[in-house]
């Protein structure tokens, strides 16, 4: 069960409720574990993880990425700008996580867990950011057409897209985790 779900909070006796910071930290680490499992299947199934042709597939993708201006790196750190970027980025990743849902055979449940846990993480972070400026949500129509476009790709591009989504999501979460520990 992901750490954000209700059953975890009533866990073992003597376990006090998780604090907001601990919840967020545990949730990100849980998702990262899930991504590792999915990457393992992807890399075992194809040679995408060693491929040098990533740029071809990356042209079709607009995956969220941390940049200096987002304020999440040690250099130029800005906690409020950064938190908004983390939430916005996670919301933008949701369509790509939806795409992943039919891309795994033995790890189908893991892909679902990553998707659901990310939704829970977004909720935790939105609570933390309650005093910050409104966060823009991706347009559902744009997301729907992106999903259709990704699903219409040939097999090689779909495999490469899966690999790139997992790699980018992992990098985004790792940067987020480092920054959130300061907050």
């Amino acid at each position: 069960v992901p750490p954000g779900e209700d059953s975890k909070d009533v866990a073992a006796p003597h376990r006090q409720p998780l604090t907001s910071s601990e919840r967020i930290d545990k949730q990100i680490r849980y998702i990262l574990d899930g991504i590792s499992a999915l990457r393992k299947e992807t890399c075992n199934k194809s040679n995408m993880c060693e491929s040098s042709k990533e740029a071809l597939a990356e042209n079709n993708l607009n995956l969220p990425k941390m940049a200096e201006k987002d304020g999440c790196f040690q250099s130029g750190f800005n906690e409020e700008t950064c938190l908004v970027k983390i939430i916005t980025g996670l919301l933008e990743f949701e369509v790509y996580l939806e795409y992943l849902q039919n891309r795994f055979e033995s790890s189908e449940e893991q892909a679902r867990a990553v998707q659901m846990s990310t939704k829970v993480l977004i909720q935790f972070l939105q609570k933390k950011a309650k005093n910050l400026d409104a966060i823009t949500t991706p347009d559902p129509t744009t997301n729907a057409s992106l999903l259709t476009k990704l699903q219409a790709q040939n097999q090689w591009l779909q495999d490469m897209t899966t690999h790139l989504i997992l790699r980018s999501f992992k990098e985004f979460l790792q940067s987020s985790l480092r920054a959130l520990r300061q907050m």
Epitope: L18, T19, S20, E22, K26, F77, E80, R181, Q182, M183
Partner: antibody
């Protein structure tokens, strides 16, 4: 040299107030969260409070919540601990500590400043 | 709050000895740290995130463990290692510390 220097400690009566300062030098102050940790004479360490790098989030131990306030002046690379309604049990050496970037470890500590609460 | 219990509270050892200090948590913790403190000085970070050696710390120090049980090991005690050692955990706020283990010269 990376350094934290605390000041502002001293003798104060129960119910009184004191403001501690922690001046940082040798590193860029702005990206780091800071904490205060105290140590009563001859006793162990007790975490008191944390502030995020921009001051948006503060955390306090139950023993000081409502009495102590942690703040920052990033232009001066200085952290402050405003201590009100002081009690005898607040008597301790107060250390400020920097939180390691990307981790929860407290990696750089000041030399400490002694606060004595007594009538 | 999470309680940390260190054992032993104090120990006597000789230079060159292998020293092991344990830290037991009341419930599973997310991150564990070890500090060294000498009289009249500030604590010094030795180990972070269970087993990572802090910058400038000699390799004779090592940390291990997970869940509720953690260990600090000094493989070959040196004269400068006589001090008090504290474990500290973070699993959300507050951070909590063990009561300390004093390592004295035999």
């Amino acid at each position: 040299e990376v350094q934290l220097v605390e000041s502002g400690g001293g003798l104060v009566q129960p119910g009184g107030s004191l403001r501690l300062s922690c001046a940082a030098s040798g590193f860029t102050f702005s990206p780091f969260a800071m904490s205060w940790v105290r140590q009563a004479p001859g006793k162990g360490l007790e975490w008191v409070a944390k502030i995020s790098p921009g001051g948006s989030w503060t955390y306090y131990s139950d023993t000081v919540t409502g009495r102590f306030t942690f703040s920052l002046d990033t232009s001066k690379s200085t952290a402050y601990l405003q201590m009100n309604s002081l009690r005898a049990e607040d008597t301790a050496v107060y250390y400020c500590a920097r939180q390691k970037w990307g981790y929860y470890a407290l990696d750089i500590w000041g030399q400490g400043t002694l606060v004595t609460v007594s009538s | 709050d999470i309680q940390l219990t260190q054992s032993p509270s104090s120990l006597s050892a000789s230079v060159g000895d292998r020293v092991t200090i344990t830290c037991s948590a009341s419930i599973s913790v997310s991150y564990m740290y070890w500090y060294q403190q000498k009289p009249g000085k500030a604590p010094k970070l030795l180990i972070y995130d269970m087993s990572n050696l802090a910058s400038g710390v000699p390799s004779r120090f090592s940390g291990s463990g997970s869940g509720t049980d953690f260990t600090l090991t000094i493989s070959s005690l040196q004269p400068e290692d006589f001090a008090t050692y504290y474990c500290m955990q973070w699993s959300g706020y507050p951070y909590t510390f063990g009561q300390g283990t004093k390592v004295e010269i035999k």
